[in-house]
């Protein structure tokens, strides 16, 4: 038997994938566990796996369909379920109704590449990744930068108010080693959250031009 | 601004049929769902059917095997095909449509259509 609190929170990345973690307070021996989403109103149910990411906290991705398909949308309610094996049948153990409108994460913005590098400017670009064409342009980005010497909790947030995948950071320190990440959020749902920070995309400023003697 | 007109009610005698219609018009947008909703006096409004992206249609019981909604996307256009019509089934008809308009969704009514059914 399983004792103490648990929590079961579970994002719709808004195309093909929902993703779940399943937090137990209580020490589960080598039990299987699995998520199962069962919607109210398509001919499809689907199961996944949940796998450690740490002590106390599972983990799975609900794949729906090919990544770009638009398999909910606003009115769909899944009924998602935490099953675990106890013997030979299984237990619930978590149950929530989850409406994936109200509850969107999005990938992680992705190809992020320097399209220019200056001594003290670069512009620098990415995709956005499987997002629902509800959303047309508009999202909004975060982006930071690490500089030398500071930690990305240091790093101050630049706020992009519309889908504008580029940016030009400016005011940099020539000849210096940088990296730079961006996230994305639709407007969209009362417990939305950003996505996932991308992958951090490493330049180098151009070295200044040496001054002539005075 | 965005426009639902319905169209289609009237009076009918038991065992009839009767085909209702919604246009959506205005502004920008993209319709995730539209569907049919029923009041009856003294009632709250509930759905009798609805069709969201990717042909999910959802009925209530009593109307299954007796009506069926059709949505044409391309048209911003949702039908309602009602036969074997009952005297139960008269009410103000509403139409409904779930729009996203600038990345937030909202839902939108129409001013409904009278059926009359008369036994």
């Known amino acids: 038997a399983v004792n103490g609190t648990s929590q079961f929170t579970c994002f719709y990345n808004s195309r093909a994938n929902i993703s779940c973690v399943w937090s137990q307070d209580g020490a589960l021996q080598d039990t299987s566990c699995q998520v199962h989403a069962w919607p109210d109103r398509r001919r499809w149910n689907q199961t996944c796996e949940l796998l450690p990411v740490s002590q106390a906290s599972w983990a799975c991705n609900l794949i729906l369909g090919a990544p770009d398909s638009q398999k909910l949308t606003t009115v769909d309610i899944v009924t998602l379920r935490v099953l675990c094996r106890e013997g030979v049948r299984w237990r619930v153990m978590a149950i929530q109704d989850f409406k994936p409108f109200e509850n969107l994460r999005l990938m992680a913005p992705i190809s992020l590449q320097v399209v220019h590098v200056e001594t003290h400017r670069c512009n620098i670009s990415w995709e956005i990744s499987q997002a629902s064409h509800y959303f047309e342009r508009h999202l909004e980005f975060e982006a930071r930068t690490l500089s030398p010497g500071h930690t990305w909790e240091e790093a101050p947030l630049l706020t992009l108010k519309q889908k504008q995948e580029w940016i030009c950071l400016e005011t940099l320190t020539p000849d210096t080693q940088y990296e730079f990440q961006v996230r994305v959020k639709p407007l969209q749902g009362e417990f939305t959250t950003w996505s996932p920070w991308s992958q951090p995309l490493a330049f180098r400023t151009k070295p200044a031009a040496l001054g002539k003697d005075t | 601004q965005v426009q639902l007109v319905e169209s289609g009610g009237g009076l009918v005698q038991t065992g009839g049929s009767l085909r209702l219609s919604c246009a959506v018009s205005?502004?920008?947008?993209?319709?995730?769902?539209m569907g049919w909703y029923r009041q009856v006096p003294g009632k709250q409004r509930e759905l009798v059917a609805d069709?969201?992206?990717?042909?999910?249609?959802k009925y209530a019981d009593s109307v299954k095997g007796r009506f069926s909604i059709l949505r044409d996307s391309a048209k911003n256009t949702v039908y309602l095909q009602m036969s074997s019509l009952k005297p139960e089934d008269t009410g103000i008809y509403y139409c409904?449509?779930?729009?996203?308009?600038?990345?937030?969704?909202?839902?939108?009514w129409g001013q409904g259509t009278q059926v009359t059914v008369s036994s």
């Open positions: 205005g502004s920008r947008f993209i319709s995730d769902v």
């Open positions: 069709m969201a992206d990717g042909g999910s249609a």
């Open positions: 409904k449509a779930g729009l996203w308009i600038a990345g937030r969704h909202s839902d939108y």
